[in-house]
Interface confidence: medium
């Protein structure tokens, strides 16, 4: 018979024959032959594989480093990775939760809408027209542009969401 060019689901093609993939939680030891099945072995204590696979090495479970403020939210199994979270009152810096911050800062151009609490992170909002923030801060709101008129000055440089207006003296018409 013709050697296969494609295999069924949960199989892979090798040496012109279809071998079974290893199930999640197991790694490949040896490919199947005409006479033997694929040989698989369970992953070790701190390892996992989460798909049907032909990997010869299992992946290491993620380490929740307490020096980065991390702790284990869900212990890994042979089929799943460990899930990390931050210590109480702290917040993940990304969806993958690779490190923690006490509370996020709002970048220049953004102000704090709500200061962080033990359970919620800082909420930032863009500074609207007429307001600015020139600092990265976990506390400061957007500040209103300086009103040059109230100081009997004129706007020399327009403000942005990151900078205040620059005021200057009015041009006096010479007689």
């Amino acid at each position: 018979p013709e050697p296969p060019t494609a295999c069924r689901e949960k199989q892979y093609l090798i040496n012109s024959q279809c071998c079974s993939l290893c199930q999640p939680g197991q790694k490949l030891v040896s490919d199947c032959t005409e006479f033997t099945e694929t040989e698989c072995l369970p992953c070790g204590e701190s390892e996992f594989l989460d798909t049907w696979n032909r990997e010869t090495h299992c992946h290491q479970h993620k380490y929740c480093d307490p020096n980065l403020g991390l702790r284990v939210q869900q212990k890994g199994t042979s089929e799943t990775d460990t899930i990390c979270t931050c210590e109480e009152g702290w917040h993940c810096t990304s969806e993958a939760c690779e490190s923690c911050v006490l509370h996020r800062s709002c970048s220049p151009g953004f102000g704090v809408k709500q200061i962080a609490t033990g359970v919620s992170d800082t909420i930032c909002e863009p500074c609207p027209v007429g307001f600015f923030s020139n600092v990265s801060s976990a506390f400061e709101k957007c500040h209103p542009w300086t009103s040059c008129e109230t100081k009997d000055l004129v706007v020399q440089q327009a403000g942005t969401n990151k900078t205040d207006v620059v005021c200057g003296p009015q041009d006096r018409l010479r007689a």
Epitope: N67, L68, G69, T93, S99, C100, V101, L102, H103, R104, S105, V135, S136, S137, A138, F139, E140
Partner: nanobody, 116 residues
Framework: EVQLLETGGGLVQPGGSLRLSCAAS????????MQWVRRAPGKGLEWVSA????????YYADSVKGRFTISRDNSKNTLYLQMDSLRAEDTAVYYC?????????WGRGTLVTVTS
């Protein structure tokens, strides 16, 4: 490399005072908000206080408001925490932290013990 060194901790009686210092190096100190954070024995971390880069704006946790005062001297790259009317529940290791409080920008901490 960012380095933060806290000093000034010690043993004090309830109602007493202590002044903590944090010497900073490895970054432009005045550009950053700085924080004090503490960890009581067997408890999680608790944010205590923060101060803006220019030192004009200060922020406090409700548990220390009116008793603690945060300040900074940008010419000396140093952060301070004046702690008055100390209580037993203020016993903790106190850390200063740069800006966001990323764990990798922390000092080793200084232990404050309030006991009679």
């Amino acid at each position: 490399e960012v380095q933060l060194l806290e000093t000034g901790g010690g043993l004090v009686q309830p109602g007493g005072s202590l002044r903590l210092s944090c010497a900073a190096s490895g970054f432009t100190f005045e550009w950053y908000e700085m924080q004090w954070v503490r960890r009581a024995p067997g408890k999680g971390l608790e944010w205590v206080s923060a101060i803006s880069g220019d030192g004009y704006r200060t922020y406090y946790a409700d548990s220390v408001k009116g008793r603690f005062t945060i300040s900074r001297d940008n010419s000396k790259n140093t952060l301070y925490l004046q702690m008055d009317s100390l209580r037993a529940e203020d016993t903790a290791v106190y850390y200063c932290a740069k800006e966001l409080g990323y764990f990798d920008y922390w000092g080793r901490g200084t232990l404050v013990t309030v006991t009679s």
